[in-house]
Interface confidence: low
């Protein structure tokens, strides 16, 4: 808290300029007025203030705007941003997609800090859905941000925003939220033909049911193993030997790599030998010829 | 590792001069400012002088006139000429540098340990 003094004679701020860096902390608090802090806010990012004088240039800020910031200002924070506390930015109303961009500049290259979080949070809940152009620019900022969501937060993206997404958006993603995404994308892409369609669906296969990527396996696709390890071993265990190896076409070869791990393992131990051996690849564990398979969970749905 | 080491301080008579030094390494890039501060004994901390990466300077009111700021042609180093010095100039002067143009002076930045300038 800065105690209250009168201004020393002639160092009545007149402007926020370069010149105040030089002043003491109760001589910022004594001569600076906080409205004209507030329509020149815009020049305080350009000086090197320290943040023991930022402290003091929000203490001002925070005194003429208890309710909380008008956006005028907030767009205009810059680095000051750095200085508010997640509490404070709950008072704010963010609409333009401008302020966020401004203030998502000033933590580039940092992870997603709490004031991010809640800024981004306050922005969302504000728009009442997670457009295009918000997610385009949340994602060039923070490329895992889809992925912080929680499935319930996700269901709020309309198919339209799918177009923004990147691959590398989608690294940390975990199976549940890929369930939320797929059919959003599956939606959002369902005019491209064939070729297209994979490019752009296959970051979001790991949601893919297995009705959906029996139907790829009859379209020439070549999946990379990569892309075949990512997807739910309860889609990939009904498929036959036959379509995993459509489905992966020249990458059939790297199963033998995987054998050992999910969802492969799981997968061989569900085949035949007998089809197994058809792949030429040594798999091995598949079901012995003369063995006869039942589907209890066939059975269970018919009792 | 980032490093700043000062040197050049000492005990100089009132009106003298002293030039202090201040090698920086380790840094992967000055895209901006350097500065000195000094903190008399007892006192806070205060920004003495500033240059930032275009070459434009800053001088607090005491010290304008008397005191020049530069950095060296290798750009890792700073300089501080002190001519005409007082008593009151007396203190521990720091250099430090800030890893980009805009924004506030400690958000990103790098401290030196300090020398010492005692004017009698």
């Known amino acids: 808290e800065v105690e209250k003094t009168a201004c020393p004679s002639g160092k009545k701020a007149r402007e926020i300029d370069e010149s105040l860096i030089f002043y003491k902390k109760w001589e910022l608090e004594a001569c600076v007025d906080a409205a004209l802090l507030a329509t020149q806010m815009d020049r305080v990012n350009a000086i090197p203030f320290t943040y023991e004088q930022l402290d003091v240039l929000k203490h001002k800020l925070d005194e003429l705007y208890p309710q909380g910031y008008p956006e005028s200002v907030i767009q205009h924070l810059g680095y000051l941003f750095l200085k508010m506390s997640p509490e404070d930015i709950r008072k704010w109303n963010v609409t333009s997609l401008e302020t966020l961009k401004a203030l998502l500049e000033v933590n580039k290259g940092h992870e997603m800090s709490p004031q991010v979080a809640t800024l981004i949070d306050r922005f969302v809940k504000g728009r009442g859905q997670l457009d295009k152009d918000t997610l385009d620019t949340l994602t060039a900022f923070y490329p895992g941000y889809l992925c912080s969501l929680s499935p319930e937060e996700l269901s709020s993206v309309p198919p339209s925003s799918i177009w923004a997404v990147r691959p590398q958006d989608l690294d940390t993603c975990d199976p549940r939220q890929l369930d939320v995404l797929y059919p959003k994308a599956r939606l959002a892409f369902q005019n491209m033909n064939g070729s297209e369609y994979f490019v752009k669906i296959q970051s979001f296969l790991g949601g893919a049911p297995t009705e959906d990527l029996k139907a790829l396996s009859q379209q020439n696709v070549s999946m990379d193993l990569a892309t075949f390890m990512k997807l739910r071993t309860d889609a990939v265990l009904p498929l036959t030997v036959a379509e995993v190896q459509k489905l992966l076409g020249p990458h059939v070869e790297g199963l033998k790599a995987e054998e050992r791990h999910r969802p492969v393992r799981d997968w061989i131990l569900r085949q035949r030998q007998d089809d197994l051996d058809t792949l030429g690849l040594g798999l091995q564990g598949g079901i012995p010829n003369g063995y006869l398979v039942l589907d209890l969970s066939m059975q269970e749905a018919l009792s | 590792d980032v490093q700043l080491v000062e040197s050049g301080g000492g005990l100089v008579q009132a009106g003298g001069s002293l030039r202090l030094s201040c090698a920086a390494s380790?840094?992967?890039?000055?895209?901006?400012?350097m500065s000195w501060h000094r903190q008399a004994p007892g006192k806070d901390r205060e920004l003495v002088s500033s240059?930032?990466?275009?070459?434009?300077?800053h001088y607090a009111d005491s010290v304008r006139g008397r005191f020049t700021i530069s950095k060296g042609n290798a750009r890792n180093t700073l300089y501080l000429q002190m001519n005409s010095l007082k008593p009151e100039d007396t203190a521990v002067y720091f250099c430090?540098?800030?890893?980009?143009?805009?924004?506030?002076?400690?958000?990103?930045?790098?401290w030196g340990q300090g020398t010492s300038v005692t004017v009698s």
């Open positions: 430090a540098a800030y890893p980009r143009q805009l924004g506030p002076y400690y958000a990103m930045d790098y």
């Open positions: 380790g840094f992967p890039y000055f895209s901006c400012c």
């Open positions: 240059i930032s990466s275009d070459g434009s300077t």
